[in-house]
């Protein structure tokens, strides 16, 4: 073994933060792969690993592609799979994974299933059905076009199956409440019998969830078929089309016919002979667990090993079972000793307390896999017969919803505001006091001044303006601000006081007592609008329902933030809505959550983090 410049962590309770995710695996599987990868080292050395939810973690885990913010760009598929930095502050100790790889458990793409009789178990590839081998979901044996797979190696023997993610089962995001696509559907007078990207510039495939989009305006996004998304060839990123014709013969799954190298491929139209469009089918992928265990070895201070059987050897090979070799164990014990594990109490970091139960994990992307009320039967052809017509509840809302890409520009609400010198640059502000969308512009408040950010070309940034000039009664330091989308009243909070502005008229300051908040609530960190004059009010890891008209909280409604918004910092100091997304700020960073405040969603449905970024670079678009 070799160590890295003698560098190691000076403490044994290591914290880690999963900053973002790959689309290749369900989030709970990614969480689990990382937890198991850390546990490998914790088994043989006196180390504990605690997941936290902020950038102060020792080891920040990130998926990225090509140039991803450090000096070591990734190189596309294969080759360099991931990299890690040795222990230390900042980027040191972090582990980055190349998201141009196919991340799996080492045995092919992981496809969760729905309904069927396997309780959500992932597909098993390859599987045998009627004596043939399948390496992707198939519609064979069905007449409704719904793709399915076996969840064991042999469907003929075991009869275990589930339905693959498909627009025929459900859609994601949009406003169609997760209902399946309706085919054909009408869009701009034309009929569509498959998902389309028409009308969108971002490439997302969508469909109508009623027969007529023009009339009903209801839609959803089509689930990605990762089992059938090709790489290479001349159609990278397109979906396999099954069945397809090659040399006059029909194929219902990927094939190696016509190739000497044995690689599986498919056509991306129904007829290869005429269209010549094709790509390689997804391969076995790389085990996220094994690669992570190797990278975490680096992040703990181990350099590469010259022992080919060691986990720290610099070449990837898939293996099952406990991955450490004696050389790996000797190395980690040289750095951290052999002693028993330390007391597994979480470190006193600001983002892990107080969480009386286990810290929240990101909402898994697998919707509930409840059995349908009528269990499907096996049809005469041996394939599973259609499942229920009702779809599973919609998945987390993470994709962009359509609508204007920029908010309406704000009118000039500043009464003779005066600008500071250009040197007062908001890009130099580490942490803003409050951020809020007011009159369509994002307002950034700091120390009695504010800037307005209009998301359009030209000069999007205005200010700084004196806060007290525009809203005369306000103190210099604010905790949060919020504009009621219905009445356009603006709420400001500072300490235990609230001010409400209607234009220039102010009501307040009012004590938080008047809102029904007890003395333990020392500040309000933000509000998010809900339908029909309601909002969510946040403070110190808790959230209440708040009536904007009566300006009272419902004391019975209080819950922990992570029950409703999984994966955001419990102690976010500023929470606001912008362009129909909720933002939770902690330090220089924000966690963005997609949620639909107009749609009647089930109370306490866990909303999904879909982005993490810098307030200055990503929201203010600082250079």
């Amino acid at each position: 073994f070799q160590t890295f410049k003698g560098l190691k962590w000076d403490h044994h309770n290591i914290t880690y933060w999963i900053q973002n995710y790959s689309e290749d695996l369900p989030r709970d599987m990614i969480d689990d792969a990382f937890a198991r990868a850390f546990a490998v080292w914790g088994e043989v050395a006196p180390l504990t690993f605690t997941r936290v939810y902020g950038p102060e973690a020792d080891i920040v885990i990130q998926f990225g592609v090509a140039e991803h913010g450090d000096g070591y760009p990734f190189d596309g598929k294969d080759g360099l799979l991931a990299h890690a930095f040795p222990p230390g502050a900042g980027v040191q100790g972090d582990a980055h994974f190349d998201d141009d790889e196919l991340w799996s458990l080492g045995k092919g793409v992981v496809i969760p299933t729905y309904y069927g009789n396997s309780n959500g178990a992932p597909c098993h590839f390859p599987f045998t059905f009627e004596g043939r081998s399948y390496s992707a979901c198939t519609t064979d044996g069905r007449n409704d076009g719904t793709p399915w797979c076996s969840t064991t190696a042999d469907y003929d023997k075991d009869g275990k199956f589930g339905f693959c993610p498909s627009e025929r089962l459900y859609t994601e995001h949009g406003n169609g409440e997760g209902k399946p696509c309706v085919f054909p559907f009408i869009f701009e007078g034309r009929s569509y019998s498959a998902c389309t990207t028409k009308g969108r510039s971002d490439g997302y495939r969508w469909c109508a969830t009623t027969a007529n989009y023009d009339q009903d305006k209801l839609y959803g996004f089509c689930p990605t078929r990762v089992d059938a998304t090709v790489v290479g060839g001349n159609s990278a990123g397109e979906l396999c089309v099954f069945p397809f014709v090659f040399l006059g013969k029909q194929y219902s799954s990927c094939t190696s016919d016509g190739r000497r190298d044995g690689r599986l491929w498919c056509a991306t139209t129904s007829n290869f002979d005429t269209d010549k469009k094709w790509g390689f089918c997804p391969d076995q992928g790389y085990s996220l667990f094994l690669v992570a265990a190797h990278e975490f070895g680096h992040a703990l201070g181990l350099d590469h090993s010259s022992v080919p059987e060691a986990l720290m050897y610099p070449l990837y090979s898939y293996l099952e079972g406990f991955p450490l070799n004696k050389d790996d164990i000797d190395g980690i014990q040289y750095l951290y000793g052999r002693g028993s594990k330390p007391d597994p109490r979480p470190p006193a970091t600001t983002t892990t307390e107080p969480q009386p139960t286990a810290p929240p994990t990101m909402c898994p992307t697998i919707p509930p896999t409840a059995y349908p009320t009528v269990g499907p039967t096996v049809g005469p052809t041996g394939a599973p017969s259609p499942g229920p017509t009702s779809s599973p509840s919609p998945g987390p809302t993470g994709a962009p919803s359509p609508g204007p890409t920029a908010p309406p520009t704000a009118g000039s609400s500043e009464a003779s505001t005066e600008s500071l010198s250009p040197a007062d640059n908001p890009c130099n502000v580490d942490v803003f006091d409050a951020i809020a969308e007011i009159q369509g512009a994002l307002h950034f408040f700091k120390d009695g001044w504010y800037w307005k950010f209009l998301n359009h070309r030209g000069s999007p940034l205005q200010g700084p303006f004196l806060t007290a000039r525009t809203w005369p009664a306000l103190p210099a330091t604010l905790d949060s601000a919020f504009e009621d989308p219905q009445t356009k009243r603006v709420f400001f909070f500072s300490g235990r006081q609230m001010w409400v502005y209607t234009g220039k008229t102010v009501l307040g300051p009012r004590s938080l007592d008047k809102l029904g908040l007890g003395p333990e609530v020392t500040h309000v960190s933000g509000l998010l609008p809900r339908r029909l004059g309601k909002a969510l009010l946040f403070s110190k890891g808790r959230v209440w329902r708040f009536d904007l008209k009566s300006q009272k909280v419902d004391p019975q409604s209080v819950i922990r933030v992570d029950k409703e918004f999984s994966g955001v910092p419990w102690n976010s100091h500023d929470i606001f809505q912008y362009q129909d997304k909720a933002y939770f700020c902690h330090g220089k960073f924000f966690w963005r959550v997609s949620f639909q405040n107009e749609v009647n969603k089930v109370d306490h449905e866990v909303n999904q983090v879909d982005d993490v970024g810098y307030v200055t670079y990503d929201l203010l678009q600082c250079p």
């Epitope: 410049k5 000096g71 070591y72 596309g76 080759g79 990299h83 040191q92 190797h294």
Partner: antibody, heavy 124, light 107 residues
């Protein structure tokens, strides 16, 4: 002992081509990222291109993108730079350099071994 | 891209004196900075990697310090063979960049 030996430089007319080679010895060549760095007469250092140990996708400075191609033959322990459509401003001493980092452990920063350089002169 | 500014452009000192060379980055690069020495007609030689670690075979009179945006190369007591051009190079962000160099000459 680590050694890097460049060859292939010379005088070429604008629009012409040259292929530089760098023979490596004394280390496990296939494990390390390799770089070309150039230095115009009397000027500072400028990175030209890098190829990762995997030999996969490569990276180029904007000034040479589309004209230069870096490659490596790990079985021969040799790094190459194919230079096409040469311009007068490409005149420089070209060095091959070994990255101190290798593979996925990226704490190192620095080029710990350099070749002696080969002069490329582009002139009519 | 990150710009590295070295100062002074030229430093005139006598053997035995202490030399302090500066390299400033246009944005934070953590500790991803290296220092090289180049003598006329020779290839650059790595002195310091990761801001403060001496490369193999480099005498102890050379030391590096700094983190973020401000970095310093110090030669505690100049020897005649130390008079050369010194370059800093960053890899805190892509693409890598070099400073314009500081010429250390005999006074």
């Amino acid at each position: 002992e680590v050694q890097l030996l460049e060859s292939g430089g010379g005088l070429v007319q604008p629009g012409g081509s040259l292929r530089l080679s760098c023979a490596a010895s004394g280390f496990t060549f296939s494990w390390y990222d390799m770089w070309w760095v150039r230095q115009a007469p009397g000027k500072g250092l400028e990175w030209v291109s890098v190829i990762y140990s995997s030999g996969g996708p490569t990276f180029y400075a904007d000034s040479v993108k589309g004209r230069f191609t870096i490659s490596r033959d790990n079985s021969k322990n040799t790094l190459y730079l194919q230079m096409n459509s040469l311009r007068a401003e490409d005149t420089a001493v070209y060095y091959c350099a070994k990255d101190r980092a290798y593979g996925d452990y990226v704490g190192w920063n620095g080029f710990d071994y350099w070749g002696q350089g080969t002069l490329v002169t582009v002139s009519s | 891209e990150i710009v590295l500014t070295q100062s002074p452009a030229t430093l005139s000192l006598s053997p035995g004196e202490r030399a302090t060379l500066s390299c400033r980055a246009s944005q934070s690069i953590s500790s991803f900075l290296a220092w090289y020495q180049q003598k006329p007609g020779q290839a650059p030689r790595l002195l310091i990697y990761d801001a403060s670690y001496r490369a193999t075979g480099i005498p102890a009179r050379f030391s590096g310090s700094g983190s973020g945006t401000d970095f310093t190369l110090t030669i505690s007591s100049l020897e005649p063979e130390d008079f050369a051009v010194y370059y800093c190079q960053q890899r805190g962000n892509w693409p890598i960049t070099f400073g314009q160099g500081t010429r250390l000459e005999i006074k």
